[in-house]
C-alpha cells in the first residue's frame, strides 16, 4: 500500500499546533485511503528545507527568497503548489517588483547613479533585494558593506530599517530610518509617498502599490515605470516592464520522489473543505494564534505548479540574477560595452557538431550549449544557460509566451537588400505521391501522416489547426491510422511510422530520421501517404539535390500538393495550392541579450553567410547537407525585424490566433509552465 502521508514541516510552536489541527480536521473529512497529514517541527525554514531534502519531511510553504535557497544544491527542492490571492476567476500567484518614477523626470534604468531612491525597507524583496541585486554590478567598489556601496551610488535615500548612524545617506530622505509605520516613508505606501512628495526620484515597490495609493487614473498617469531595457512604460504595463516577477508563497518538495501529486491532492481537498469561507471550525488561511501560520492569511486558495517548472523557471531569470548577485557578490572584471560570447543552443549531437565548428571559426564570439529538445533549449535560454537559437514559428510562439523575443528572421529569397527586408513567410503544404490519385484534403481520415514535429508550423500547427476546425477534437492519433510526428507520446500511433532506433524513436531532434522537413518528406517517400512540410521541401530533395541513398533518384514530378478545395496541383503551383502562409523561422533570445545577439549574428553572417561560395573548404553558417542544422539550409540571410520585435507582431495576428486555438490540444509542458507565470 503506497504511503499517502504528507509530512508537513512547521517552524514554531504555533505552526505545530495549527498543523496538528490541520491533520485532525483532514482525518475527519477524507476517506481512510486518501491523503493524510503528519507534522514535523523544526527550528527554522532552512532546517525544514534540509529535512525535506533528507526525506525527513515532505512539504513546507516558503517566500520567494527561501524558494531560491531550497532550489540550491544540495537541497534541490522544487515548487509544487502556489498560493493565490485575489479571486478564483483571476488568481494572482505572483507580484511584480517595479521602479516607479515621475513622468517628467527623463532618466532611464541605466542612469540611476546619483539619483535619490525610496525603498520599502532594508532587506525586503521589491524594495531592496531585487533592485539592489539587479544594480549590484553597477555599484561602486568595494561593494561590501552593501549599504555603503548603495549609499555611494544614490545621492540620497530612504531605506527604512537601515543603520542611520553608520549609513546616514540611506536615511537622508527619512531621518532616523524608522522600521515601522511611524516612519511616513516605510513600506510600500511609504516608499511611494517618498516619491510622490518629491523627496526621491525613484521608488522601488510592487506593481499594485500605485493603484492602491492613487485611485484616479489621471493621477496615475503622472507616473511611469522604468524598464530593464532602458525604456519607460505606463504604470498599467507592469507585465511588460518590471524588475522581476516574484512568486508570493509556494509549497516546495523534493525534485525526485517528492510526492508532488499527493501534496496537490491533499491541498486541493483541504481548500475544498477548509478554504476561504468554507468552515467555521478550521480555516486553512487563518491564524488565530499568530500570523501566516503554514500558509498566508491573505491567500484565497492553491494552484498546482506545472510539473515542467523547476525553481529557476518559477522564480524567473531577473529574480534569480538579482538574488544570486547579492548572495555571491561576483561581477565581471570591469563592466564593458563589449558583448560577451553568444551561447547558441544546439539540438542533439548533429547540431552540436555544426555549432562546435562555428564556435572555433567565430574566434570566441559563439559558444555552444546542448539540449535534447527545442523546449529544453528554450528553457535554457530563459534561465540564462544559453542565449539564442533559430526557431520555427510554432516555437517562436512558445518562446514568446515564455518571455523571449525574436531578434532576426531567416530570409529564403535572394534579393539585393536581404538583411533589411524580412519576408512575408513561406507556404505550408500537404504533399502526396502522384500515384495515390484518389487522395484529397477531404479524405485523409485513416491515412498515414508524416509531420516535421509536434508544435512546428508547417508540420503541425497549420495542418492540425485546420483539421481541428473540421473534427472539433484533439485526437489526431485517431484521425490518422498511423504516422510520424516527432515529439508525440511514444505509445501514440503518431510515433508508429517513425524510424529512430531505441530511445531516439519519435524524438523531436535529428536522431529521429523522420524529423524536420527532410525527415517528414523521407517518411512520405518510404512509408506515408501525406507529408506536411514547406513549399521548398520537395524541390530541395529531388532531382539529385539530396545525395542521400533514399533521395538521390527521386523526381519532383512524382509528387503533388493537396489543395484545401479538394483538388490537387503540381508541386510548383504551391502559391495557389497551400494550407497557409507560415512565418519564417526566427532567432530568439532574452530581452537583455537582444542587442548583443543582433550585433554578433550580423557580424557572423557577413563572415560565414551566403557570400561564402566554397562550403567544402570553408565554414558555411547556412549549410548542412539538407539537415537544416541550426538554421534552415535555404537561408540566404538573417534579416532585421524593424518594428516586428515581439512574438505577436512577428508571427502576425492570424497565426497567433490559429496557434491559440490549438492550445487546447497542446501537449507542450513548457507552454503550460510559461502560461502559469503569465496567463
Amino acid at each position: 500500500v503506497p504511503d499517502k502521508t504528507v509530512r508537513w514541516c512547521a517552524v514554531s510552536e504555533h505552526e505545530a499546533t495549527k498543523c496538528q489541527s490541520f491533520r485532525d480536521h483532514m482525518k475527519s473529512v477524507i476517506p481512510s485511503d486518501g491523503p493524510s497529514v503528519a507534522c514535523v517541527k523544526k527550528a527554522s525554514y532552512l532546517d525544514c528545507i534540509r529535512a525535506i531534502a533528507a526525506n525527513e519531511a515532505d512539504a513546507v510553504t516558503l517566500d520567494a527568497g527561501l524558494v531560491y535557497d531550497a532550489y540550491l544544491a544540495p537541497n534541490n527542492l522544487k515548487p509544487v503548489v502556489a498560493e493565490f490571492y485575489g479571486s478564483k476567476e483571476d488568481p494572482q500567484t505572483f507580484y511584480y517588483a517595479v521602479a516607479v518614477v515621475k513622468k517628467d523626470s527623463g532618466f532611464q534604468m541605466n542612469q540611476l547613479r546619483g539619483k535619490k531612491s525610496c525603498h520599502t525597507g532594508l532587506g525586503r524583496s521589491a524594495g531592496w533585494n531585487i533592485p539592489i541585486g539587479l544594480l549590484y554590478c553597477d555599484l561602486p567598489e568595494p561593494r561590501k558593506p552593501l549599504e555603503k556601496a548603495v549609499a555611494n551610488f544614490f545621492s540620497g535615500s530612504c531605506a527604512p530599517c537601515a543603520d542611520g548612524t553608520d549609513f546616514p545617506q540611506l536615511c537622508q530622505l527619512c531621518p532616523g530610518c524608522g522600521c515601522s509605520t511611524l516612519n511616513q516613508y516605510f513600506g510600500y505606501s511609504g516608499a511611494f509617498k517618498c516619491l510622490k512628495d518629491g523627496a526621491g526620484d525613484v521608488a522601488f515597490v510592487k506593481h499594485s502599490t500605485i493603484f492602491e495609493n492613487l485611485a484616479n487614473k489621471a493621477d496615475r498617469d503622472q507616473y511611469e515605470l522604468l524598464c530593464l531595457d532602458n525604456t519607460r512604460k505606463p504604470v498599467d504595463e507592469y507585465k511588460d516592464c518590471h524588475l522581476a516577477q516574484v512568486p508570493s508563497h509556494t509549497v516546495v518538495a523534493r525534485s525526485m520522489g517528492g510526492k508532488e501529486d499527493l501534496i496537490w491532492e491533499l491541498l486541493n481537498q483541504a481548500q475544498e473543505h477548509f478554504g476561504k469561507d468554507k468552515s467555521k471550525e478550521f480555516q486553512l488561511f487563518s491564524s488565530p494564534h499568530g500570523k501566516d501560520l503554514l500558509f498566508k492569511d491573505s491567500a484565497h486558495g492553491f494552484l498546482k505548479v506545472p510539473p515542467r517548472m523547476d525553481a529557476k523557471m518559477y522564480l524567473g531569470y531577473e529574480y534569480v540574477t538579482a538574488i544570486r548577485n547579492l548572495r555571491e557578490g561576483t561581477c565581471p572584471e570591469a563592466p564593458t560595452d563589449e558583448c560577451k560570447p553568444v551561447k547558441w543552443c544546439a539540438l542533439s549531437h548533429h547540431e552540436r557538431l555544426k555549432c562546435d565548428e562555428w564556435s572555433v571559426n567565430s574566434v570566441g564570439k559563439i559558444e555552444c550549449v546542448s539540449a535534447e529538445t527545442t523546449e529544453d533549449c528554450i528553457a535554457k535560454i530563459m534561465n540564462g544557460e544559453a542565449d539564442a537559437m533559430s526557431l520555427d514559428g510554432g516555437f517562436v510562439y512558445i518562446a514568446g509566451k515564455c518571455g523571449l523575443v525574436p531578434v532576426l528572421a531567416e530570409n529564403y529569397n535572394k534579393s539585393d537588400n536581404c538583411e533589411d527586408t524580412p519576408e512575408a513567410g513561406y507556404f505550408a503544404i500537404a504533399v502526396v505521391k502522384k500515384s495515390a490519385s484518389d487522395l484529397t484534403w477531404d479524405n485523409l481520415k485513416g491515412k498515414k501522416s508524416c509531420h516535421t514535429a509536434v508544435g512546428r508550423t508547417a508540420g503541425w500547427n497549420i495542418p492540425m489547426g485546420l483539421l481541428y476546425n473540421k473534427i472539433n477534437h484533439c485526437r489526431f492519433d485517431e484521425f490518422f491510422s498511423e504516422g510520424c510526428a516527432p515529439g508525440s507520446k511514444k505509445d501514440s500511433s503518431l510515433c508508429k511510422l517513425c524510424m529512430g532506433s531505441g530511445l531516439n524513436l519519435c524524438e523531436p531532434n535529428n536522431k529521429e530520421g523522420y524529423y524536420g522537413y527532410t525527415g517528414a518528406f523521407r517518411c512520405l517517400v518510404e512509408k506515408g501517404d501525406v507529408a506536411f512540410v514547406k513549399h521548398q521541401t520537395v524541390p530541395q530533395n529531388t532531382g539529385g539535390k539530396n545525395p542521400d541513398p533514399w533521395a538521390k533518384n527521386l523526381n519532383e514530378k512524382d509528387y503533388e500538393l493537396l489543395c484545401l478545395d479538394g483538388t490537387r496541383k503540381p508541386v510548383e503551383e504551391y502559391a495557389n495550392c497551400h494550407l497557409a502562409r507560415a512565418p519564417n523561422h526566427a532567432v530568439v533570445t532574452r530581452k537583455d541579450k537582444e542587442a548583443c545577439v543582433h550585433k554578433i549574428l550580423r557580424q557572423q553572417q557577413h563572415l560565414f553567410g551566403s557570400n561564402v561560395t566554397d562550403c567544402s573548404g570553408n565554414f558555411c553558417l547556412f549549410r548542412s547537407e539538407t539537415k537544416d542544422l541550426l538554421f534552415r539550409d535555404d537561408t540566404v540571410c538573417l534579416a532585421k525585424l524593424h518594428d516586428r520585435n515581439t512574438y505577436e507582431k512577428y508571427l502576425g495576428e492570424e497565426y497567433v490566433k490559429a496557434v491559440g486555438n490549438l492550445r487546447k490540444c497542446s501537449t507542450s509542458s513548457l507552454l503550460e509552465a510559461c502560461t502559469f507565470r503569465r496567463p
Epitope: K354, V360, N361
Partner: nanobody, 117 residues
Framework: QVKLEESGGGLVQPGGSLRLSCAAS????????MGWYRQRPGKQRELVAA???????NYADSVKGRFSISRDNAKNTMYLQMNSLKPEDTAVYYC???????????WGQGTQVTVSS
C-alpha cells in the same frame, strides 16, 4: 572524400602524457576545420578541441591548459598533445574534419585512452 585514422592511444598513469595523431588519406590543406572528440562510457560524444586552417583553436573547459591541438598540413596530420592526464580523460578519442559524413554518424574507429594507476 578524405579518410581519417586516429592513433596514439594507450594506458597511462594519472599525471602522464600522450600524443594522439589523426592521419588523413589525402590533403588536409583545403579542410577548414578539424577537431578531436571523445566518448566516455555511457556518455554522449563531446568536443575536446578544434582548430581552423588559420590556426584558431577552441578547447573544452575541462581540458584547457592541459591539452594542445595542432595540425601539420604538409604531413596531412592533426595532433592532440595531452598532458596532466586525469582518470576522467578515459575515453575513445575520434578526429573529424566536419564533413557531411559526421552528420551521418559515420565516425572512424577512434583510439582508446585509459588513465589509471
Amino acid at each position: 572524400q578524405v579518410k581519417l585514422e586516429e592513433s596514439g592511444g594507450g594506458l597511462v598513469q594519472p599525471g602522464g602524457s600522450l600524443r594522439l595523431s589523426c592521419a588523413a588519406s589525402g590533403s588536409i590543406f583545403s579542410i577548414n576545420t578539424m577537431g578531436w572528440y571523445r566518448q566516455r562510457p555511457g556518455k554522449q560524444r563531446e568536443l575536446v578541441a578544434a582548430i581552423t586552417r588559420g590556426g584558431n583553436t577552441n578547447y573544452a573547459d575541462s581540458v584547457k591548459g592541459r591539452f594542445s591541438i595542432s595540425r601539420d598540413n604538409a604531413k596531412n596530420t592533426m595532433y592532440l598533445q595531452m598532458n596532466s592526464l586525469k582518470p576522467e580523460d578515459t575515453a575513445v578519442y575520434y578526429c573529424t574534419d566536419y564533413s557531411r559524413r559526421y552528420y551521418q554518424d559515420d565516425w572512424g574507429q577512434g583510439t582508446q585512452v585509459t588513465v589509471s594507476s
